[in-house]
């Protein structure tokens, strides 16, 4: 995903930030109103300009500055750690007028044995340690406080939780003589929530637990536990919801089977099976009860865990997710795609679509991509004419004052948005594809031909001539 080069070279990082004590809770914040864009769809740009100008004119009247940065807070409870024993933490940007809180779980694969964790530690240490984290991060996409970039929840309290546990946010084991690494992903989330209660979360109306990739799977694994935690701590009125982006994987048959040697070629079922033991992973209780002991790995797969969840969850998933293709040993590297592989890819999209059939709140464009919600251009993709921020807004409305999605969809405000066209990038609003080798942008027609799709076969079901279809796709229609 874009805009995420935040590492600092050794010797260039600032001194570690001081561990700040929790600020006393401010007076009861006033709820800000969700924006309803129903009437302004046609003239969104000028509406946004007005909103921004209004927002900026109000800034001098408040304690907030127009500062996009989220600030690092290392956990006060230093026994809740990253893999290497350094304290876990979170980045926070408060929005005192809002009772909405967005907690975002970062992604970044995982490691599942000593060897690949050692190698990860020596090449991707920021995903295993907080030692070199920068003091601040810029909020992008759904974490942005700019209404043009984030028309959905720009005014929310933004929390970014860095992924440093390598366990798909599921682990509950600490570093010891026996364990070289701690795997505390599930505990990190609990501790962050606990600390945020002292920073204003206690007055929240809605807590949206969001995440991308491994963080998206982390949402599915932790959303009910967070709701339960808040209930037990005496905050039953906070509505907990989930937004899982690019974390809804299939335990399908790999295109080419390979032995489980490293993280990216190991079949997902086998990687998770091994990982769960190595991490002492925990899964949602209601899901765990559905499977025998030793079969908890099933709960890492969205279509199996989702039906057991109590909290409402919105699922965002590219139908042709690059991480899914990677674990399935599909590597699109510029060579024309053979028919067997083309059929495999098409079938993957079909299977994914089928698993989302009974997910009322979902957004699944037929694109080849990975992650979306913290991309700056997350507003660009549409399914059936509806953008993701708009779909999320409709979802909010459908959940208004209730903990479960209402059965009747709001008129003109859809929340179940799954592309039905059958091939990658048949949706013209998909992110631009670049030729892997020339780096040149490809239009949809070029991409499909490059993928080995026969235009005759593609055009026929649409009732079009291949030349007509090519013309339409080239024009992005």
């Amino acid at each position: 995903s874009e805009g995420r080069k935040t590492w600092r070279r050794r010797g260039q990082q600032p001194p570690p930030p001081p561990r700040t004590e929790a600020a006393p809770a401010a007076g009861q914040p006033v709820e800000s109103f969700p924006l309803d864009f129903t009437a302004v769809e046609g003239n969104m740009d000028s509406f946004m300009a007005q909103v921004k100008s209004l927002a900026q004119s109000l800034y001098p009247c408040s304690a907030q500055q127009l500062n996009e940065d989220l600030r690092l807070h290392l956990l006060l409870n230093t026994s809740v750690t990253c893999n290497d024993g350094s304290p876990a933490g979170y980045y926070l940007k408060e929005s005192r007028g809002s009772r909405r809180w967005l907690l975002f779980l970062e992604g970044g694969w995982y490691c599942f044995n000593r060897e690949n964790c050692d190698s990860r530690y020596d090449t991707m240490r920021r995903l295993m340690s907080s030692r070199d984290w920068p003091r601040t991060r810029t909020g992008t996409g759904i974490l942005s406080s700019q209404p043009e970039e984030n028309p959905y929840w720009w005014n929310a309290n933004m929390v970014f939780i860095p992924y440093c546990s390598s366990d798909v946010w599921s682990g509950a084991s600490s570093k010891s003589e026996k364990n070289e690494y701690a795997f505390m992903g599930a505990l990190i989330i609990q501790e962050v929530v606990r600390e945020l209660l002292g920073r204003g979360l206690s007055g929240a109306k809605v807590l949206l637990l969001a995440g991308s990739a491994a963080g998206g799977t982390g949402v599915l694994l932790n959303v009910d536990r967070v709701a339960e935690q808040l209930e037990k701590l005496g905050y039953p009125a906070i509505q907990v919801r989930g937004l899982a982006d690019s974390g809804w994987f299939l335990d399908n048959k790999q295109y080419r089977h390979t032995d489980c040697v490293d993280t990216i070629t190991c079949a997902p079922t086998e990687a998770i099976r091994r990982g769960i033991r190595y991490w002492n992973g925990v899964v949602p209780e209601r899901c765990r009860r559905q499977f025998q002991e030793g079969e908890e790995w099933n709960c890492f797969f969205g279509y199996k865990v989702y039906p057991t969840l109590r909290c409402p969850v919105f699922v965002v998933q590219w139908l042709f997710d690059e991480a899914q293709l990677t674990v399935d040993n599909v590597h699109l590297t510029g060579q024309p795609v053979q028919e067997g592989l083309r059929l495999y890819i098409q079938n993957l999209g079909r299977e994914l679509r089928h698993t989302l059939k009974d997910v009322p709140a979902s957004f699944a464009p037929a694109c080849l991509s990975h992650e979306i919600i913290i991309r700056s251009h997350w507003t660009d993709v549409q399914v059936k004419g509806t953008s993701l921020p708009r779909a999320l807004h409709c979802w909010d409305r459908s959940l208004h004052d209730s903990h479960k999605a209402s059965k009747t969809p709001l008129k003109g405000c859809p929340v179940h948005l799954v592309d039905s066209c059958p091939w990658p990038h048949c949706n013209p609003s998909c992110p631009t594809v670049r030729d892997q080798f020339t780096g040149q942008e490809m239009n949809v027609a070029q991409f499909l031909m490059h993928m080995g799709f026969d235009m005759q076969t593609v055009a026929q079901p649409q009732g079009l001539e291949p030349s007509e279809l090519l013309g339409m796709l080239s024009n992005g229609s």
Partner: antibody, heavy 119, light 111 residues
């Protein structure tokens, strides 16, 4: 100043053994994964082996597997490469390199030690 | 194993002109927003020297005429404007997974 200094090269008979060393200074050795990279005369770079920062994981290129043993002594800031059953194709300049932990790139290289396998 | 194919094997560029070297991986070396491709320069009798890391970040002390780009499986090293001292062999290297591998090298000659 960050420095890596290889030693132990020289002339060895085919089938013979040799132990190369790499002495590190100017940085916390135990913080970094270390690698050996070799270069045959007039040829390109070939990655040979990796030792994790704690020394608990080692990984070898297929071309050398079974004939090389990589180890490190973090208390002495030294990396070792023990080579057995040497062949003429092992003739090369052997470099020890430090891998940056925010990407795995080699941000520091030694000057190399030359090994010749010949009868 | 990931195979890196570097091209061209050699090139001659006039002083002040642009040199472009390509590196293709047999599968994607990008993940979680980072591309694990790095570029080195090697002159005869010397060890390699890091120029570009993580596809596009310039190593400190390296002149700004060196730049890197690309993602997924396709990467490029550009040198512009080329200077006399840039005559050397250039290698790409991936650290996405073990085993690490290098490209076969590109020898740059200044005309």
């Amino acid at each position: 100043d960050v420095q890596l200094l290889e030693s132990g090269g020289g002339l060895v008979q085919p089938g013979g053994s040799r132990k190369l060393s790499c002495a590190a200074s100017g940085f916390t050795f135990s913080d970094f994964g270390m690698h050996w990279v070799r270069q045959a005369p007039e040829k390109g770079l070939e990655w040979v082996a990796y030792s994790s920062s704690g020394g608990t994981t080692v990984y070898y290129a297929d071309t050398v597997k079974g004939r090389l043993t990589l180890s490190r002594d973090n208390s002495k800031n030294t990396l070792f490469l023990e080579m057995t059953s040497l062949r003429s194709e092992d003739t090369a300049m052997y470099y020890c390199a430090r891998a940056s932990y925010d990407g795995g790139y080699f941000d520091c290289w030694g000057q190399g030690t030359s090994l010749t396998v010949s009868s | 194993d990931i195979v890196l194919t570097q091209s061209p094997a050699s090139l001659a560029v006039s002083l002040g002109q642009r040199a472009t070297i390509s590196c293709r991986a047999s599968k994607s070396v990008s993940t979680s927003g980072y591309s694990y491709i790095h570029w080195y320069q090697q002159k005869p009798g010397q060890p390699p020297k890091l120029l570009i890391y993580l596809a596009s970040d310039l190593e400190s002390g390296v002149p700004a005429r060196f730049s890197g780009s690309g993602s997924g499986a396709a990467f490029t090293l550009n040198i512009h404007p080329v200077e006399e001292e840039d005559a050397a062999t250039y290698y790409c290297h991936h650290s996405r997974e073990l085993p690490f591998t290098f490209g076969s090298g590109t020898k740059l000659e200044i005309k």
